[in-house]
C-alpha cells in the first residue's frame, strides 16, 4: 500500500532508502530541456516476489527543444554537474541491498535524468537521514523514518535529528526541544494496530550507519 505522503523534511538534511520495497514507484523525470518519451512510462516500479525483485519499466528522456515550454530549456549549472555514482561499496555498508527479500536496489541512472529522484514509497519503507555538508547532527534518537499504517491511514514517524551549522553556537543535545510526532501524538501512543513490515531488521544498523549510504544525493 502506498504511503499517502512524503517522508518528513528535516532542515539541512537529506534522506535515503537503502533498499526499496515492492510496489515503490520512481517517477521518470527528466532534466531541464528534456522530457519523457511519448510512449514512455510514467514511472519505474519495484516489482517481483520474495526471492527476486527488480525495477519494471525503463525511464527514457528525449530532447524537448522542438516543444514549447514556458521557461528556457537551457540546463541549469546544478543540472550540468555529473551525478554521483549510485554504487555503495564502503566497507561500512551495513546490509547488502540485494540480500533483502522483496526489495529492489537503487536503480541505475538513465540518460538525461533529473537531478532529484521522486519516489512514491509503500508502507513499511524506512528512510535514513543525514545532515548535508556543513551541518552536524544532534541526535535525540534514530535518524530514520518509517511509513506506518495507523487507524487505516499512513504516516511517517518523525526522525529524531537536528542539523546545526558547524560554526553556530547551538544548544547541547540535552537542551533540545522535544520534536512532536505527526498529529501531535507521542510515538508510544498506539492504541490501535500499527502495521510495519520486515524493515525491523534494519533498525540496528542505523546507529552504525556511515556517510557511505548517502553517496548519491538527488538534490
Amino acid at each position: 500500500e502506498l504511503c499517502d505522503d512524503d517522508p518528513p523534511e528535516i532542515p539541512h538534511a537529506t534522506f535515503k532508502a537503502m533498499a526499496y520495497k515492492e510496489g515503490t514507484m520512481l517517477n521518470c523525470e527528466c532534466k531541464r530541456g528534456f522530457r519523457r518519451i511519448k510512449s514512455g512510462s510514467l514511472y519505474m516500479l519495484c516489482t517481483g516476489n520474495s526471492s527476486h525483485s527488480s525495477w519494471d519499466n525503463q525511464c527514457q528522456c528525449t530532447s524537448s527543444a522542438t516543444r514549447n515550454t514556458t521557461k528556457q530549456v537551457t540546463p541549469q549549472p546544478e543540472e550540468q554537474k555529473e551525478r554521483k555514482t549510485t554504487e555503495m561499496q564502503s566497507p561500512m555498508q551495513p546490509v547488502d541491498q540485494a540480500s533483502l527479500p522483496g526489495h529492489c536496489r537503487e536503480p541505475p541512472p538513465w540518460e538525461n535524468e533529473a537531478t532529484e529522484r521522486i519516489y512514491h514509497f509503500v508502507v513499511g519503507q524506512m528512510v535514513y537521514y543525514q545532515c548535508v555538508q556543513g551541518y552536524r547532527a544532534l541526535h535525540r534518537g534514530p535518524a530514520e523514518s518509517v511509513c506506518k499504517m495507523t487507524h487505516g491511514k499512513t504516516r511517517w514517524t518523525q526522525p529524531q535529528l537536528i542539523c546545526t551549522g558547524e560554526m553556530e553556537t547551538s544548544q547541547f543535545p540535552g537542551e533540545e526541544k522535544p520534536q512532536a510526532s505527526p498529529e501531535g501524538r507521542p510515538e508510544s501512543e498506539t492504541s490501535c494496530l500499527v502495521t510495519t513490515t520486515d524493515f525491523q531488521i534494519q533498525t540496528e544498523m542505523a546507529a552504525t550507519m556511515e556517510t557511505s549510504i548517502f553517496t548519491t544525493e538527488y538534490q
Epitope: L2, K38, S41
Partner: antibody
Framework: QIQLQQSGAELVRPGTSVKMSCKAA????????IGWVKQRPGHGLEWIGD????????NYNENFKGKATFTADTSSSTTYMQLSSLTSEDSAIYFC???????WGQGTPVTVSS | DIVLTQSQKFMSTSVGDRVSVTCKAS??????VAWYQQKPGQSPKALIY???YRYSGVPDRFTGSGSGTDFTLTISNVQSEDLAEYFC?????????FGGGTKLEIK
C-alpha cells in the same frame, strides 16, 4: 494531509473563456505533475494534459491543443487551466489530479450557456 | 491513441458476491494500468496502480490483475458501499486514456 482544492462552479457564455484553479497542499508542489481531466455525462473521462509546476513543462492531448492552457504559480502552490472559445461541448466537470493520479480535486463544474 | 474498452457498461451483483470488471487495451500497455472508483457526485478515487497494487486505505476485497492488453478488477464479498462506476486507465503512453466505465449495481 494532501489536498487538491479546486475553484467553484462556472456559468459562462459561448465564445468566452474561463480560468479555473487547483490549489495543492500537504506535499512539495514543485515535485509532481498536475494533470487535468474532463468528465461529461455519457462521455466518460478524458485526459486533457498535464503540467510540471517545477519547470512549467506541459503536455497536451492533441484534442485539447488550442482549447486548454495550463499555468502554475509556485508561490501559491496553485495550477490554473484556461479554456478558450467555449462551446456547449465544453460543458463538463473538470478535475485536477496529482501524484501519479493518486489524488484528485473535487472538480469544477463548467456550464456554457447563452 | 490507445483505446481502453470496458465492454460491460452495467453489472448487477448482490452483497457478498464476487464480481469482475474487465478492461481491454487496443495495444500492449504492460502493467501501466490504474483502476478508479467513482460514486455519484464525487471525484474518482484511485484504487489500483500498476495493474495489481492497491493504494492505501483500499479494502483488500479489491484486487487488480492482468498485463499486456487484458486487465481485470475483481471485487470479492461485494458491499453496498461498492455501488459506483469503475474506470480503467492506461498511462503507458501519451495521451493517457480511460475506459468508458462500468456501473456496478447492487441488487
Amino acid at each position: 494531509q494532501i489536498q487538491l482544492q479546486q475553484s467553484g462552479a462556472e456559468l459562462v457564455r459561448p465564445g468566452t473563456s474561463v480560468k479555473m484553479s487547483c490549489k495543492a497542499a500537504g506535499y512539495t508542489f514543485t515535485n509532481y505533475w498536475i494533470g487535468w481531466v474532463k468528465q461529461r455525462p455519457g462521455h466518460g473521462l478524458e485526459w486533457i494534459g498535464d503540467i510540471h509546476p517545477g519547470g512549467s513543462y506541459t503536455n497536451y492531448n492533441e484534442n485539447f491543443k488550442g482549447k486548454a492552457t495550463f499555468t502554475a504559480d509556485t508561490s501559491s502552490s496553485t495550477t490554473y487551466m484556461q479554456l478558450s472559445s467555449l462551446t456547449s461541448e465544453d460543458s463538463a466537470i473538470y478535475f485536477c489530479t496529482s501524484r501519479n493520479f493518486a489524488k484528485w480535486g473535487q472538480g469544477t463544474p463548467v456550464t456554457v450557456s447563452s | 491513441d490507445i483505446v481502453l474498452t470496458q465492454s460491460q457498461k452495467f453489472m448487477s451483483t448482490s452483497v457478498g458476491d464476487r464480481v469482475s470488471v474487465t478492461c481491454k487495451a487496443s495495444q500492449n500497455v504492460g502493467t501501466n494500468v490504474a483502476w478508479y472508483q467513482q460514486k455519484p457526485g464525487q471525484s474518482p478515487k484511485a484504487l489500483i496502480y500498476s495493474a495489481s497494487y492497491r493504494y492505501s486505505g483500499v479494502p483488500d476485497r479489491f484486487t487488480g490483475s492482468g498485463s499486456g492488453t487484458d486487465f481485470t478488477l475483481t471485487i470479492s464479498n461485494v458491499q453496498s458501499e461498492d455501488l459506483a462506476e469503475y474506470f480503467c486507465q492506461q498511462y503507458n503512453s501519451y495521451p493517457y486514456t480511460f475506459g468508458g466505465g462500468t456501473k456496478l449495481e447492487i441488487k
